[in-house]
């Protein structure tokens, strides 16, 4: 009889993670007597996958009934494939022997590659907020995919970005891979409602890419603009001064009124007007009893926004000569009025 040949007809097999992989092997003869074994890898470090003779291999089933004498098919099926199962599998015929069976002949090997989907991309932004015209970095990460080929794109509000750097690790062969990308985005005042999107395309996704998003609202701080104005009053001994705080984001804002440098009142913004671009407006007003002042008064609206250094705007309130003459007879009494909102500036 011709000497036994071990035939592994497929050089490579590709399987999606979670599926079963069938590795085909046939013998041309049953001589010599001895078991068939399957290994992953070659050489001293090879891993036993199946031994016809003995052992418990819960994920492995034989495609044919190996106890039938005329059976020359020694194909196996491995269930629930994961990326860790990737490698080259060898079907090996042993000759019965002692103290160990003797390797008689090996098949050429079948390379099993595992197609594994990338994890949902996770996009994270900067740790601290930045103001418009500054550049911030966003990162996108996805893991566990195979094969290595992958495409990553960045978008801002549907427009593709070009300023980004992407790495796929590891550089060499691996059971699965990770991707890490950093995009640089220039902030604009209108970015409160903007989104950045990381889009990943991979062979396992069948043309339906995965997307991860981040809101620029988490990354941006739009500082307020202040305007202090005096409103007309019927009573000549009262002045109504308003501080219009406009186009700021995020909400957190504390306002302090100072009269000639002395704190008159501090309040925290609560009822805000939201603009179409996502920024907020707020107005505070101060009712000043002009009779309490002999001289002109400098009113300062001081705003601390989002924990940043305070910004301020001052207004010089003129005290008329008539009021100055009678001022000494009037008890110093500044009436502080409650705040009132001002209509939004679309």
């Amino acid at each position: 009889e011709d000497e036994l040949q071990v035939i592994q007809p497929e050089k490579s097999v590709s399987v999606a993670a979670g599926e079963s992989a069938t590795l085909r092997c046939a013998m041309t003869s049953l001589i010599p007597v001895g078991p068939i074994m399957w290994f992953r890898g070659a050489g001293a470090g090879r891993e036993l996958i199946y031994n016809q003779k003995e052992g418990h291999f819960p994920r492995v089933t034989t495609v044919s009934e190996l106890t039938k004498r005329n059976n020359l098919d020694f194909s196996i099926s491995i269930s629930n494939i994961t990326p860790a199962d990737a490698g080259t599998y060898y079907c090996v015929k042993f000759r019965k022997g002692s103290p160990d069976d003797v390797e008689f002949k090996s098949g050429a090997g079948t390379e099993l590659s595992v197609r594994a989907k990338p994890s949902a991309p996770v996009v994270s932004g900067p740790a601290v907020r930045a103001t418009p015209e500054h550049t911030v970095s966003f990162t996108c990460e996805s893991h566990g995919f195979s094969p290595r080929d992958i495409t990553l794109k960045w978008f801002k509000n549907g427009n593709e970005l070009s300023d980004f750097q992407t790495n796929v690790d590891p550089a060499g062969d691996s059971v699965s891979y990770s991707i890490h990308s950093t995009a640089r985005v220039v902030l604009t005042r209108g970015d409160v409602h903007s989104q950045v999107i990381c889009e990943i395309a991979h062979i396992t996704l069948q043309g339906d890419p995965l997307r991860g998003t981040a809101n620029l609202s988490e990354a941006i701080r739009v500082p307020p603009t202040l305007e202090v104005t005096q409103q007309p009053m019927r009573a000549e001994n009262q002045a109504n001064v308003t501080c219009q705080v406009s186009n700021f984001y995020p909400r957190g804002l504390q306002l302090t009124w100072l009269e000639n440098g002395n704190v008159s009142r501090t309040e925290t913004a609560s009822t805000l007007i939201e603009n179409k671009d996502g920024t907020y407006n707020w107005m505070s007003w101060l009712l000043v009893n002009t009779c309490a002042h002999r001289d002109d008064v400098v009113l300062t609206c001081q705003v601390e926004h989002d924990g940043q250094q305070a910004v301020s705007k001052s207004y010089a309130l003129e005290i008329s000569a008539h009021q100055k003459e009678h001022g000494s007879d009037i008890t110093h009494e500044a009436a502080l009025a409650p705040t009132a909102p001002l209509g939004g500036s679309g």
Epitope: E1, L30, I31, V33, G34, P35, I36, Q52, K53, E54, L66, T67, K68, R69, N70, N71, K96, G97, S98, P99, D100, D101
Partner: antibody, heavy 118, light 107 residues
Amino acid sequence: EVQLVESGGGLVQPGGSLRLSCAASGFTLSSYDMHWVRQATGKGLEWVSAIGTAGDTYYTGSVKGRFTISRENAKNSLYLQMNSLRASDTAVYYCVRGGVWDDAFDIWGQGTMVTVSS
Amino acid sequence: DIQMTQSPSSLSASVGDRVTITCRASQDINNYLAWFQQKPGKAPKSLIYTASSLHSGVPSKFSGSGSGTDFTLTISSLQPEDFATYYCQQYVSYPYTFGQGTKLEIK
């Protein structure tokens, strides 16, 4: 049903000959290694001879040159030609099938008695 | 030739007992060891191959273990039909050889 049935045993004088037959049913005999095992009355089991699927033959030392194992594929039968028989060859002879990949004995015949006596 | 030695040669036990028979090879036989059961006037019956694998139809109360030179056959709970003679056999190389047998008797 897989079955082995031996025949051809009997009483023979020392120096005489006998041919044992084993008829296989339920499987193709030529696809398996086949064996003869014997057991003297009140004694243990002794392996006698084997024939491989390639026609290779094997014997225990005490029968070498006297016994010949063979098979006839057309009749799906195994044979043991015993010549120059001795009193020590007296035993029940069993036909046995070897297992698929390791030749472990799996199917036994019921046996046939060979008595060598003058 | 490889010598196979069984112990004990005979053993008395009661129904329900757990019994162990040992078999030693004169040289390493890997795990190519078989166990057979034989009742008076009957052909042997194959129980175990490759030291621990049960032949089809053999009840799980029979179990085998060992590798190299030392092997055991265990019957977990003896039933009346289990009283018989048990043989071990090496089949790693020709000539295949049997142990001398262990006769299991009712106490």
